[in-house]
């Protein structure tokens, strides 16, 4: 990796694009801290591990983030 | 439709300063990481320096270290680029461009967007 | 600090042939980092690729990209007569945080 977490912040660019969670690999939501001062949301695809950073004021973005707590919360007994 | 159009170069002596601007159009300007990029006079083309989308993380050429900032103001859609201390070498086209979407700092997109370019003379 | 090698410096073909433009990194380089651009006389840069071998949107399928570690190739299967152009590998790395190559200029054989 080029640059380490020292950088603050992750996102260069974030995509308002919904995601399919059934390509989604994995869904980081980084909380604000003192390397960052916004959420970070960083979704990695199954096609070729693409890592994407999406908006977290976007819409689809909130509508992807309650469809995966809800399959989540399917699968957790 | 998507644009960015660069302005402000001109010629200008060694030592003295200028500063460049870039006006995004058609597109969300405050959620893209923006780059500036240069190209010399029949020369291949060398990056500048970076910026993301909240203006959190900038990143500079060593050949600009110190010399150059770049900044943004997304409320009026526009990327700059202060340069001072300029030598006969950073004469060249400047363009400015868009970083794609979603990048990061683990997957990069590409620069998917350019300006036209504008020039920048250094000559006493 | 990552030098990128492009060659041929040039490559001389004629419509309809293929075209393999080559760029070779001094250290390895993820592909999740390496792009490639076109540039025309007068022209700004245009992304063709990124991660690669993803195509960049609108770009034809004619274009593609391929490898990985050191050894990255830019192929065009059938040269357009708009295709003739300059070719530029990026990477992006430390120090510089991105990397241009040399460029291969693809002309008219």
């Known amino acids: 990796i080029p640059l380490s977490r020292t950088v603050r912040c992750t996102c260069i660019s974030i995509s308002n694009q919904p995601v399919n969670p059934r390509s989604l690999e994995k869904l980081e939501i980084i909380p604000p801290s003192q390397f960052c001062p916004h959420v970070e949301i960083i979704a990695t695809m199954k096609k070729k591990g693409e890592k994407r950073c999406l908006n977290p004021e976007s819409k689809a973005i909130k509508n992807l983030l309650k469809a995966v707590s809800k399959e989540r919360s399917k699968r957790s007994p | 439709q998507v644009q960015l159009v660069e302005s402000g170069g001109g010629v200008v002596q060694p030592g003295r300063s200028l500063r460049l601007s870039c006006t995004a159009s058609?597109?969300?300007?405050?959620?893209?990481?923006m780059h500036w990029v240069r190209q010399a006079p029949g020369k291949g083309l060398e990056w500048v320096a970076v910026i993301s989308y909240g203006g959190d993380i900038k990143y500079y050429a060593d050949s600009v270290k110190g010399r150059f900032t770049i900044s943004r103001d997304n409320s009026k859609n526009t990327l700059y680029l202060q340069m001072n201390s300029l030598r006969a070498e950073d004469t060249a086209v400047y363009y400015c461009a868009r970083e794609g979407e979603g990048s990061n700092i683990y997957y990069y997109y590409g620069m998917d967007v350019w300006g036209q370019g504008t020039t920048v003379t250094v000559s006493s | 600090e990552i030098v990128l090698t492009q060659s041929p410096g040039t490559l001389s073909l004629s419509p309809g042939e293929r075209a393999t433009l080559s760029c070779r990194a001094s250290?390895?380089?993820?592909?999740?980092?390496l792009a490639w651009y076109q540039q025309k006389p007068g022209q700004a840069p245009r992304l063709l690729i990124y991660g690669a071998s993803s195509r960049a949107t609108g770009i034809p399928d004619r274009f593609s990209g391929s490898g990985s570690g050191t050894d990255f190739t830019l192929t065009i299967s059938r040269l357009e007569p708009e295709d003739f152009a300059v070719y530029y590998c990026q990477q992006y790395g430390s120090s510089p945080i991105f990397t241009f190559g040399p460029g291969t200029k693809v002309d008219i054989k």
């Open positions: 058609g597109f969300t300007f405050s959620q893209y990481g």
């Open positions: 250290q390895s380089v993820s592909s999740s980092y």
